[in-house]
């Protein structure tokens, strides 16, 4: 089969594609982000980076491929760069920046039922225990109906 995909040029901000093998069918382009601590992920059509809900766990993507139909897969327009996870998950401090499904809710550090010390300690220190450092993990005991009154966020 012959032909090639068009040069992927309408990229979302901070996304970079490297296509060492060109754009022929079967060629792969590596995805990366200009910001060193961001990761390339696929978002649904109606979701932007600015309004990703904490419960959304987008799929990481490392490459796109030129298909036989001369289309890139996944489509580059669906690939975005999001803040990566800081390497402080499961260390007994609830890091606001990691309190999202994509970072496994900071490894359990933001819920009384899952943090090892059984006391949520926020970081930054001013992080609101009812806001960015709240217990958001839907799997935590705090969110099972029978235990709703059994745990506090403090």
């Amino acid at each position: 089969m012959q032909g090639q995909c068009s040069v992927p040029n309408e990229l979302n901000s901070n996304l970079k594609l490297q296509c060492p093998d060109g754009y022929a069918i079967g060629s792969e382009c590596a995805t990366s982000c200009l910001d060193h601590n961001s990761e390339s992920i696929i978002l649904p059509m109606n979701v932007t980076v600015r309004d990703i809900p904490h419960w959304l766990n987008p799929t990481r993507v490392e490459r796109v491929v030129c298909t036989a139909g001369l289309k890139w897969y996944p489509h580059p327009a669906l690939i975005h760069c999001v803040k990566g996870c800081e390497p402080f998950m499961g260390d007994n401090y609830c890091d606001a920046i990691n309190n999202r499904a994509f970072c496994n809710y900071d490894g359990g550090d933001c819920c009384t039922s899952t943090v090892k010390t059984k006391k949520v300690t926020p970081f930054p220190m001013s992080c609101d225990l009812q806001g960015d450092c709240a217990c958001r993990d839907p799997q935590a005991q705090e969110h099972s109906r029978k235990d709703l009154r059994g745990y506090s966020h403090g």
Epitope: E86, Y93, D95, K119, T121, F123, P124, M125
Partner: antibody, heavy 119, light 107 residues
Framework: EVQLVQSGAEVKKPGESLKISCKGS????????TGWVRQAPGKGLEWMGI????????RYSPSFQGQVTISADKSISTAYLQWSSLKASDTAVYYC????????????WGQGTMVTVSS | EIVMTQSPATLSVSPGERATLSCRAS??????LAWYQQKPGQAPRLLIY???TRATGIPARFSGSGSGTEFTLTISSLQSEDFAVYYC?????????FGGGTKVEIK
């Protein structure tokens, strides 16, 4: 008057152990976290770690993890910084500083403890 | 870790003049930025927190601005007691990091 009073200057040999202290007074110790900051001679400030008032959870900057131990005894309103085996590169002034639990910035600092490590 | 870069390393200013110090973060820290003043043989003193809020007892000639990655400390009219080293610090992402400092000296 709110104060953080640190223990006095120390001169040690490489390989020796050391524990320096920071005693808080004039405020409720359990309403504040305590941080430790290093300043090597002629150099800038380096954040070492913090401890919350319960004394059970300390958090270390990666470059100090495993090199020092931060602890606290809330019954005597005192935080500690200790080394099990000092190195010449540990020579520095060490400051303790306190911050309110819902604040990210230390509002009161100790006077500093000079630690000299030399053979 | 987030790297904080201060410029210039040394600033020579005459008393009464305006001093502008810069601090750049390697990634966004929102408005989580503090400025400290340190004089020889003394502990640092908090001047500004959350980017632009003056700490208790700090004179109005000190002001902070900026957010994200670019921050500025301005001293509107330098007094003799303002000659010191100034550090910026971010407490947004662990580890907390300081800039290398800017020394403000008499011209």
């Amino acid at each position: 008057e709110v104060q953080l009073v640190q223990s006095g200057a120390e001169v040690k040999k490489p390989g020796e152990s050391l524990k320096i202290s920071c005693k808080g007074s004039g405020y409720s110790f359990t309403s504040y976290w305590t941080g430790w900051v290093r300043q090597a001679p002629g150099k800038g400030l380096e954040w070492m770690g913090i401890i919350y008032p319960g004394g059970s959870v300390a958090r270390y900057s990666p470059s100090f993890q495993g090199q020092v131990t931060i602890s606290a005894d809330k019954s005597i309103s005192t935080a500690y910084l200790q080394w099990s085996s000092l190195k010449a590169s540990d020579t520095a002034v060490y400051y303790c500083a306190r911050g309110p639990l819902r604040s990210d910035y230390p509002d009161v600092w100790g006077q500093g403890t000079m630690v000299t490590v030399s053979s | 870790e987030i790297v904080m870069t201060q410029s210039p390393a040394t600033l020579s200013v005459s008393p009464g003049e305006r001093a502008t110090l810069s601090c750049r973060a390697s990634q966004s820290v929102g408005s989580y930025l503090a400025w400290y003043q340190q004089k020889p043989g003394q502990a640092p003193r908090l001047l500004i927190y959350r980017g632009s809020t003056r700490a208790t007892g700090i004179p109005a000639r000190f002001s902070g601005s900026g957010s994200g990655t670019e921050f500025t400390l301005t001293i509107s009219s330098l007094q003799s007691e303002d000659f010191a080293v100034y550090y910026c610090q971010q407490p947004y992402v662990w580890p907390i990091t300081f800039g290398g400092g800017t020394k403000v000296e008499i011209k």
